[in-house]
């Protein structure tokens, strides 16, 4: 640790005195102290000497000697008082800048330690301190306002009692800055803009911050726009607003607009796109396939995306048949706005009934005309099967009718014994009918197919089963021949045919 001569913590001298402060260390040493006049600095081997032959009140302060090469950073200090009866204060600063809630040190250094008992801090022109101002005093350093607040940004003076009268220091301006959490907050309105050529448009870029020191600008396709700025202060925030007004837009006004604000913490920017069109437009689309297939009893949401400018003047969902003249219930139609020019319209069809298959159309209208988008909804059904015994051209024939959607496939099984359903162990013969006859196939209806199995002689201790299946499910019908006729077994029930 360096050593200072004279080896006293404080030195009190009169104005005009010669003061010599010598610092000696193991290596090179360096003096640090307040910016003040009249000092001469010179080196003498491993010591550094600070001297003045005309000390003034301005030399009052703490002088510290350090060894720059010392990794432990040891230092020694001496405080010099130059007690001038006419100048009780040496003020080291015109201005002190701190952030809110920091301690603010107002560097009024007392030039005579004897005066410490009668010191006080006041605002300029003798005004008292603001309420709740918590401060302390150190003769070496000055007054400290603890946890300074923005409202305490004032001009202050230090006061000392000398011979019964108060002597003031020159003033110190305290600037308490708000803590800036980050770059200014930004808004750019609208987020997107579409106009027809010749219409008026307005784009508003605004930025706000707790501190007034920030810049904001609006740029179009990387060109900074010269727009007058409006400033305001409310809700404890400074606001700067740039408003671009275009009376008659043209294609050159289209493009990307960016609102950019910056302060000491950094920069924020937000962008929007301005589209200029020749005329009104209305576009309907769907991410769904326009041809929909849903199993009966299930639900479906039909969604249409609408892009339009100007806004819609009307819209509705319509059922175009073929089953009934019912119309979708309004409560099942839902509209959501994605943004100003894009909307999604949804029709909810819960627990679909057979009569609800068919065409659903969404119609929309704006000044550009009207558009429609139509969905075709077909319901899927599991096959329903029935078998009858008949004679065709004199031959005994089993006739199987299967009805469902999609079109069912048909398989015949012959098995031993009398049973509701053939299982693998009983199966004697299997016939696939790759091309059953289509009896009916209308849009939005079930497909009915018919399969014929010609049987020369019915075996009486056997069962004939017609099975039909599609992507939804399967159905079957068991036919049991008996001497007096035949038994037929639909699934899960018993029928007797005389």
């Amino acid at each position: 640790i360096p050593v200072i001569e004279p080896s006293v913590p404080e030195l009190v001298v009169k104005p005009g005195a010669t003061v010599t402060l010598r610092c000696v260390g193991n290596g090179s040493v360096e003096w640090d102290g307040p910016p003040s006049p009249h000092w001469t600095l010179y080196s003498d081997g491993s010591s550094s000497i600070l001297s003045t032959n005309n000390a003034t009140f301005q030399n009052t302060g703490t002088y510290r000697c350090t060894e720059p090469g010392d990794p432990l950073g040891g230092s020694a200090a001496i405080h010099l008082y130059v007690k001038d009866p006419a100048r009780p204060w040496n003020v080291l600063a015109q201005e002190v800048v701190v952030f809110e809630d920091q301690d603010a040190l107002l560097p009024c250094l007392l030039t005579d330690p004897v005066l410490e008992a009668g010191v006080s801090l006041v605002r300029v022109r003798g005004r008292p301190l603001m309420r709740h101002t918590n401060y302390s005093f150190s003769p070496w350093h000055g007054f400290t306002i603890h946890r300074a607040k923005f409202i305490q940004s004032q001009d202050y003076q230090c006061s000392a009692l000398m011979g019964g009268r108060k002597v003031m220091s020159i003033s110190i301006r305290l600037k308490v800055q708000k803590v800036i959490p980050g770059p200014p907050a930004l808004t750019l309105v609208p987020a997107e803009l579409v106009r027809i050529r010749g219409e008026a448009a307005q784009i508003v870029c605004s930025a706000s911050s707790v501190d007034v020191n920030f810049d904001v600008f609006l740029q179009h396709n990387n060109t900074k726009l010269a727009i007058p700025q409006q400033s305001d202060f409310h809700n404890n925030r400074y606001q700067k607003v740039l408003t671009l007004n275009l009376d008659q837009v043209d294609f050159q006004h289209a493009g990307n607009y960016s609102c950019v604000a910056s302060n000491v913490q950094g920069k924020h920017s937000t962008s929007m796109f301005f589209r200029v069109v020749e005329s009104a437009y209305l576009n309907l689309s769907s991410e769904q396939n326009l041809i929909q297939e849903v199993t009966v009893g299930e639900g479906l949401n039909l969604k249409v995306m609408v892009e339009a400018y100007p806004g819609l003047q009307g819209f509705n969902w319509t059922y175009l048949g073929p089953f009934s003249d019912h119309q979708p219930e309004p409560k099942l139609a839902n509209a959501t706005t994605k943004d100003t020019y894009r909307h999604t319209f949804t029709l909810s069809l819960p627990r679909l009934k057979p009569s609800e298959a068919g065409r659903y159309s969404f119609l929309a209208r704006n000044p550009g005309g009207w558009r429609a988008l139509t969905f075709e909804l077909t319901l899927r059904y599991p096959p329903e099967v029935s078998v009858i015994w008949t004679f065709i051209n004199g031959s005994g024939t089993l006739l199987c009718a299967a009805s469902g959607y999609p079109q069912p496939n048909v398989t015949w099984l012959q098995c031993s014994g009398h049973t509701d359903r053939c299982d693998e162990a009983q199966v004697l013969q299997v016939w696939d009918d790759p091309y059953p006859e289509v009896l009916s196939q209308e849009p939005f209806h079930k497909v009915t197919v018919q399969s014929l199995l010609t049987v020369e002689t019915l075996e009486h201790n056997q069962t004939y089963e017609c099975r039909a299946h599609n992507s939804v499910g399967s159905g079957s019908w068991a036919f049991i021949p008996i001497s007096a006729g035949a038994h037929t077994h639909p699934p899960d029930e018993f029928l007797f045919t005389p």
Partner: antibody
Framework: QVQLQESGPGLVKPSETLSLTCTVS????????WSWIRQPPGKGLEWIGY???????NYSPSLKSRVTFSVDTSKNQFSLKLSSVTAADTAVYFC???????????WGQGTLVTVSS | QSVLTQPPSASGTPGQRVTISCSGS????????VNWYQQLPGTAPKLLIY???QRPSGVPDRFSGSKSGTSASLAISGLQSEDEADYYC???????????FGGGTKLTVL
């Protein structure tokens, strides 16, 4: 070894605020005092102001109304803000360290700021 | 207009001795020490002389400073081509409570 480095935009528009930062290494800005000096192209040096510990600042009378210094001891940085700039503020801006008896013993390399629209 | 006054230019041939003057007033040079700075083309100023006549380590002893009353001077002996630079004097000013500079002297080595 004490080193100072100025940073900030090289171009500022008239009437806007010039902002520069000086980053110090090899010394603590809690010690000594720290100045900004400028030099217009082809001209001499002009002292702008200095700050001494805890945000205490003194400014050149000719610039006082437009200057603000701020300090970030955690980053060992100090900053200059000069408001309402004109073409006359075009200069190379230097930051420098000072100590008792020597107003400027270490300097940054300087940064040119041009004021133009 | 600079507070301290310096001649705008000075010149000399290699090996010669050149002196640059700096004059001020009682509030600056008269009551405070003088510092000299050398600024090579395109670089930052560098401390050359402090406290009237003290040289920082690394500065050749060809450079010396002196002060008398309200004036100071910088002497460069054994002039070398690398000494071609701008030279500035500076001093604390009591009335300003801050440092002041001279206008600078451009030294040309012929």
């Amino acid at each position: 070894q004490v080193q100072l480095q100025e940073s900030g935009p090289g171009l500022v528009k008239p009437s806007e605020t010039l902002s520069l930062t000086c980053t110090v290494s090899g010394a603590s800005i809690s010690s000594y005092y720290w100045s900004w000096i400028r030099q217009p192209p082809g001209k001499g040096l002009e002292w702008i102001g200095y700050f001494y510990y805890s945000g205490s600042t003194n400014y050149s009378p000719s610039l006082k109304s437009r200057v603000t210094f701020s300090v970030d001891t955690s980053k060992n940085q100090f900053s200059l803000k000069l408001s309402s700039v004109t073409a006359a503020d075009t200069a190379v801006y230097f930051c420098a360290r000072g100590k008792v008896g020597v107003p400027f013993d270490y300097w940054g390399q300087g940064t040119l700021v041009t004021v133009s629209s | 207009q600079s507070v301290l006054t310096q001649p705008p230019s000075a010149s000399g041939t290699p090996g010669q001795r050149v002196t640059i003057s700096c004059s001020g007033s009682s509030s600056n040079i008269g009551s405070n020490t003088v510092n000299w700075y050398q600024q090579l083309p395109g670089t930052a100023p560098k401390l050359l002389i402090y406290s009237n006549n003290q040289r920082p380590s690394g500065v050749p002893d060809r450079f010396s400073g002196s002060k008398s009353g309200t004036s100071a001077s910088l002497a460069i002996s054994g002039l070398q081509s690398e000494d071609e630079a701008d030279y500035y004097c500076a001093a604390w000013d009591d009335s300003l409570n801050g440092p002041v500079f001279g206008g600078g002297t451009k030294l040309t080595v012929l």
